[in-house]
């Protein structure tokens, strides 16, 4: 028994930002599970992984390192990517591993999402620079 | 006026626990991500743990995962950490520091520090 | 993750002087590098975020320049206040990571 996953086919992200979310055929609720995303179409890098184990609060962490958090909806997990390159744009997938309660369940494989990212415009810099921020 | 004020530190065996508390004022607690940067006695800046602004994800330094725990009471305006299984090395001052939610790891505001000493 | 290396460790100069103190990282963090100043005793506070922007409250005379692998923060004349420890840190990739720092000593 797979857990099916579905992913927006393309996703454009402006301003090296972007939020992918990957839903489940699956409630997670009370589950302990490990959602990751993979980058590419053998997913050989993993991007960002979401552990979650009953509590209310999602570990986060990525070994690769892509500056990522995620956020738990009860059949779903979003990533939220920033500070990417125009040269990672490629296709990425969302996987699932529920380790509790028994069975240990794993997901088909999706058709992944294309992140586009795009450059950022290079502005002439203004005559005066806005506001200082703390 | 923003401000930051850690408490909770002291000295502790190895292998014990502590937990610190950062109580903040002056701003909108709620609306920002919130951090722990160590400083290990006359040494560098450590970044150690973070949490989203409502507490609902967290991230840890690999060296201190698993026996640190990030947490915070938007209620109280209140973030904490709690420290177990604590070794030598975990010897520093512990900063909490506030990140715009948007930038995520840029550190505008940092307390005065709580200084946590694991010694026999 | 990313090492960020300081250069010099420790810079003597006497107030008035111009110091110029390097970060250097390991692979491109765009623009997202920080500086802090942290005196004995003290907190580390924010001077100039996203490589060349200032902090509210910083004097002009904090500059910072630089993307990529190479950054430069720059005090164009010492005042006396200046004298302490200058951190660079990234937030480009996680986990965030920081320089050794470079120390700000009277000459």
């Known amino acids: 028994n797979k857990i099916l996953v579905k992913q927006s086919p393309m996703l454009v992200a402006y301003d090296n930002a972007v939020n992918l979310s990957c839903k489940y055929s699956y409630n997670l609720f009370s589950r302990e599970f490990r959602a990751s995303l993979h980058k590419g179409l053998d997913s050989a890098v993993e991007v960002c992984v979401v552990y979650g184990n009953y509590s209310q609060q999602l570990q986060v962490y990525s070994k690769t390192g892509f500056n990522c958090d995620g956020k738990l909806g009860n059949e779903s997990v979003t990533f939220y990517l920033q500070n990417l390159y125009v040269n990672q744009t490629d296709i990425y997938f969302c996987k699932i591993e529920v380790m509790y309660p028994p069975p240990y369940l794993d997901n088909e494989k999706s058709n992944g999402t294309i992140i586009h990212v795009k450059g950022k415009h290079l502005c002439p810099s203004p005559l005066f620079p806005g506001p200082s921020k703390p | 006026e923003v401000q930051l004020v850690e408490s909770g530190g002291g000295l502790v065996q190895p292998g014990g626990s502590l937990r610190l508390s950062c109580a903040a004022s002056?701003?909108?607690?709620?609306?920002?991500?919130m951090h722990w940067v160590r400083q290990a006695p006359g040494k560098g800046l450590m970044w150690v743990s973070r949490i989203n602004s409502d507490g609902s994800s967290a991230s840890h330094a690999e060296s201190v995962r698993g026996r640190f725990t990030i947490s915070r009471d938007n209620a109280k305006n209140t973030l904490y950490l709690q420290l177990n299984g604590l070794r030598a090395e975990d010897t520093a001052v512990y900063y909490c520091a506030r990140a715009d939610s948007s930038t995520w790891y840029e550190f505008d505001f940092w307390g005065q520090g709580a200084l946590v000493t694991v010694s026999s | 993750e990313i090492v960020l290396t300081q250069s010099p460790a420790t810079l003597s100069l006497s107030p008035g002087e111009r110091a110029t103190l390097s970060c250097r990282a390991s692979q491109s963090v765009s623009s997202y590098l920080a500086w802090y100043q942290q005196k004995p005793g003290q907190a580390p506070r924010l001077l100039i975020y996203?490589?060349?922007k200032r902090a509210t409250g910083i004097p002009a005379r904090f500059s910072g320049s630089g993307s990529g692998t190479d950054f430069t923060l720059t005090i164009s004349s010492l005042e006396p206040e200046d004298f302490a420890v200058y951190y660079c840190q990234q937030r480009n990739n996680w986990p965030p990571t920081f320089g050794q720092g470079t120390k700000v000593e009277i000459k």
């Open positions: 002056g701003f909108t607690f709620s609306s920002y991500w």
């Open positions: 996203d490589a060349s």
